[in-house]
Structures are given as C-alpha cells and as structure tokens.
Amino acid sequence: IWELKKDVYVVELDWYPDAPGEMVVLTCDTPEEDGITWTLDQSSEVLGSGKTLTIQVKEFGDAGQYTCHKGGEVLSHSLLLLHKKEDGIWSTDILKDQKEPKNKTFLRCEAKNYSGRFTCWWLTTISTDLTFSVKSSRGSSDPQGVTCGAATLSAERVRGDNKEYEYSVECQEDSACPAAEESLPIEVMVDAVHKLKYENYTSSFFIRDIIKPDPPKNLQLKPLKNSRQVEVSWEYPDTWSTPHSYFSLTFCVQVQGKSKREKKDRVFTDKTSATVICRKNASISVRAQDRYYSSSWSEWASVPCS
Amino acid sequence: RAVPGGSSPAWTQCQQLSQKLCTLAWSAHPLVGHMDLREEGDEETTNDVPHIQCGDGCDPQGLRDNSQFCLQRIHQGLIFYEKLLGSDIFTGEPSLLPDSPVGQLHASLLGLSQLLQPEGHHWETQQIPSLSPSQPWQRLLLRFKILRSLQAFVAVAARVFAHGAATLSP
C-alpha cells in the first residue's frame, strides 16, 4: 500500500483466483484513543472499533472511503483504491490501446517545435467517475522539471456503438534548451482513477522524436506566363522554432487530381517555393518536416489549382 | 578550413557535408519507431557518447559569440563516431551488406572532421569506450543504438553549419 496523495491510498493486488487478499491496517488520524468507530462510504454501519482497523482487501467491494468517527464527529478519512496486477502485468482497463506506432501505446505525444512544449493525449470509453493526474520530468534518476497542466476532455467521437473520449494535457520543460542534442528522455506519467480503480501509464521519448510541425502557412499560387506551370509559395508555420536558418524545414509539394486513383506528382524542396504543373481540377498540397531529423511530417496545407 | 584558435570554417562546405551526413545516417537506419531502443538498457552504450549540450555554445547566440566552442564539440563527436563506425561493432559479424550506407557514412564523418581540423592542428578528442559485444545480436543492437544516437548528433551539427553558412560566412 502506498499514498497517492493526502488520505488517498493505493492497494496493489495480485488479481488471480486463489490470490490471498492484502492485509491493510488503517489508523485514525486523531489523538483520541477510545470510542472510535469505523464506517465505509455512505453506510452508517459500524465495521469496527478502535484507533486502528485491520481489513482484508481482495475486491473492489473492500475499497472505498473508510471513515473513523467519535460521538457523531468525523475524525479522519482514508480512501482506498485498487491497482490490479494480472499475470504480473498491471491492468490497463481505463485507457484504450491506440496501437500507433506500436501495440500497448496508451499515451501519444507531439511537439510543434523544439521549445520544450508538448501535448500528450489518450483515449477512453469511460465517461464518468474518471480523474487524471499528469507528472513529467526530463530523465528519471536525477529528474529535471517539466510542468504539466490539468488534463482536459478535448474531443468526443462515436465509434460504432461506443463513444470514445479523448483527453489531452500540455506540458512545458522548465529549462528547455532547443538547440541541444537531447541525451535524457522526457518521462510522462499519467495516474488514472476510475471509481475505485487506480492505473498508471507512462511514456518516454525525446522531443526530437515527437516533432510534428504545423502545416506551412500562406500557401499561394502564381501562374507563370504562357505556361501550364505555376509557382507555389508558402511560409514556415508561426509555431515553428526560430531562427529558420538554424531550425530549418524541408517540404513536400504534391499535385493531386480529383480522383484519389490519379497519379500524384511529388516534389521535395528545402526552399519555400516550387514550380509545378497545375492540372485542371487538381489541388496542390504542401507539408513540412524537420530538415535534418526525420520525425513526422506535418498535415497538408492545400489550395485548388483553378 | 577551421583553424583552431579563431579562423572560420568553410561554413558552406560544412553545411553540405553535414546535410549529406543526415541523409546517410537515416538511410543507414531508417526504421525509426520499430524498435524502442531505450527499453533495451542503454547504460553502457550511449552514456559515453559525446552529446552537444546546452552549454556547448551551439545555439544561434553562442555561435555568434564564439563558434569555436561548438565546433570543437562537433569535431570531438565526429571523431568519436568515426572510430565507432570503423570498429568491430560495424566490421564484425553479422557483416554489413556491400551497398550499406555505413561505409559512406564513415567516410563522410572523417571528411567533415578534416574540414573542421586540418592536419597539424589538434583539439583534444574523447576516448572511445571499449565496446566489444560478444554476440552477433548484441552487435546488431549496438549498431542500431549508435546510429540512432548519430542521427541526433548530426542533426544538431547540420543546424549549426546551416545557420553558420547563412549568417556567419564572410
């Protein structure tokens, strides 16, 4: 058993049929010695008396808020949560496996630049009695500070018969060094509590590996005289790290016909313009990627040819 | 050429070669994300690698103030990786394919380090750790780790030279 926060405790349970329960001794936080009784949750039934209460925790029915009283007055509370371990593996019932980029990916994180700011998100089908707490650091043995905000519900989607809820959190490295080569990964830890079930999820990454620039901005076409060619121009997204002479992007320009089956013409360039042939009813799209490190491409920015 | 003690490197040449290094490093180990190498116990392998750190002056302001600190750090790293790529980690079993970009990568590391430090001038170099994995699979894992680490290193070096070429070239 360990303390998650004040008056909230997590009991770690081996979850197999013939596992013995976990013996927990609750102590009433009071100088009083006599006349103390214990209750669970909203029930007024007395579970025991005395300054300590010894319980066996084996099921979710044994978890909850234990309260000690004296003469009708509440003295202290202890909320017990359960963390299940099945076949030596901690349960992951609360969050959905996003399976990208690999199985058992519960947390996904992205950064728009090298400023040390990043966003993580996760999915669940649970709609109520759900709380999240996020902590992060750079490195684990001698951790350096990363400050995370509160996790918020960022999207709701219908998937078949189920509703899916997306939560996200923004974090910022306290003393980020955008130009340095990272040697210690960022660690992100999410505590998830659903009713009386506790679970924790972790992710470890370098900012450089989760970079995904915003799409290029101000995408414009300039027809070239007496030609089917157009000059496409664009700018670095506002959110990208500066100066651009240091934090450079590379770009992919694509000409795509109306039909998805039509052949796509692609051009790669480090410049912020390119000359392409504009076909009727086609569209021109541009996306960006870090020039020197192959992290994710941005989403496409597009304009129609006409 | 960068003469230790103050003169500027051939920024544009360094830029071109460092960008080529980036391309080669990624073609040598393109499978990003397919193998989480940090789960495989890095300690003895990549802790000794020279990293370009915050105080090394490789940020735009640091380069403007005095690029020599940063260039020395980059030079150290290039020599370090050049030695690693020439060691039995890469020359031993399992053999690299004849068309593997590792050979080109090795030569380019050497080329860039010589651009930064001509013969007769010496910056102190870092000792290469004695890594001699016994099993072929350990060697394979070590190669992946070294290449991943090299990708990060050459990305920072390429940024430095691109910025130098754009803002510090005479």
């Epitope: 209460l53 084996k58 099921e59 | -």
Partner: antibody, heavy 119, light 107 residues
Framework: EVQLVQSGAEVKKPGESLKISCQSS????????IGWVRQMPGQGLEWIGI????????RYNPMFRGQVTMSVDKSSSTAYLQWSSLKASDTAMYYC????????????WGQGTMVTVSS | EIVLTQSPATLSASPGERATISCRAS??????VAWYQQKPGQAPRSLIY???NLQSGIPARFSGSGSGTDFTLTISSLEPEDFAVYYC?????????FGQGTRLEIK
Amino acid sequence: EVQLVQSGAEVKKPGESLKISCQSSGYTFTSYWIGWVRQMPGQGLEWIGIMSPVDSDIRYNPMFRGQVTMSVDKSSSTAYLQWSSLKASDTAMYYCARRRPGQGYFDFWGQGTMVTVSS
Amino acid sequence: EIVLTQSPATLSASPGERATISCRASQSVGTWVAWYQQKPGQAPRSLIYAASNLQSGIPARFSGSGSGTDFTLTISSLEPEDFAVYYCQQYNIYPYTFGQGTRLEIK
C-alpha cells in the same frame, strides 16, 4: 435493520429451470457484495460464490461454475440464483448472505430457500 | 482449495461449562477465519470474524483465537441457547470454504 428476504420453497422436476431471489433492505445494496451458500440435507455449508451489485463482477467456486448463474437487479436490490436444467443432486437449502467489506465473511444471512428436485 | 477440519465432530457439554472447538486449515489463511452458529431450521449466524473479533450483538462469552492454520472458538460458560452446530470458514483464498461443522449437544 439489515434484512435479506428470500423467495419461497420450490419443488421442481429434473431438467426444469429455476430462478430464486433474495431481496435486500436496510442498507445500501450497491455497497456490499452478495453471496450464495448451499446446504444439502443433513450436510454442512458450501460456498457457491459472491457477486458485486455494482458491476456484476462474480467469483464462483469452481465446483459450481457452469452449474448455476448468479445475477443482480440493482433497481430492486435483488440478487438471483438460477439453474437452466435442474438435477436431483441440486436438492438443498440455498442461503443468500451479505459479504462484509474489508473482510469477506458473511455478516447477514437470508432465511434460506428450500429447492427440491424430484421426478 | 483450502480444506478446514473441525474437531471434535460432536461435543457434549453441560450448561455453565466451557466449550472449545478447533478448526485446522490445510494451509495458512492468516487471521481470515469466521465462525458461525446454526440452529435447526434456521440460517447460520455470524459470531466471530478475523479469527478473534466479536460480531456486533454477540454475547461476550463467545471468543475466538488463532492464526495461520490453527483456530479455536471458545464459549466460556454455556447457556442453553448455545447448543447448535458451529462452522468455521476461511476467507483468505477463493473458493472460500467451510469446516464440516461441530455439533454442540447437551450432555
């Protein structure tokens, strides 16, 4: 006052189905798991299993798994034990009981339902 | 599963006497043992839980002791209404199991 009131005695033929009930009152039904115990004529007590009224999480005695089904209806604070095909060997007194949280033993018992299976 | 063996199977005693019933587990169950009393035609009634804790409303002449594999129910001074069948139960490991019972009869 905590009370568990069970349905009346049943006489059935082999192969028939049956569902007996246990209605709880005097406490918060969803805060306590409900269990069932069998007592064959002249014999001792046998633990069938327990069930959570919150999410219908069940722990069966392997000896009874597949033989009986436990269920609950939260809206009526009622627990059920059912058979799809009775056998003569199912003849027994069946007790429902409330599981004490933080312990696991049964602190309050129903009065029992006698099930007789005979051709 | 854990087997609980009660002894004696039948205990003959007189009102006012001290009665002791033993319960032995086939493996350790900590202190997670309960004792129940059952009178003819009635449902069992909880007496003792966690080996030695008296259930609310049960007279103080009933007491329990033991831990691990050996447990004892003691009735310090028998009253006429105490003559019944007594069962021990372990609730440490599923499936929870009962002893075969001890019949306490009037000598």
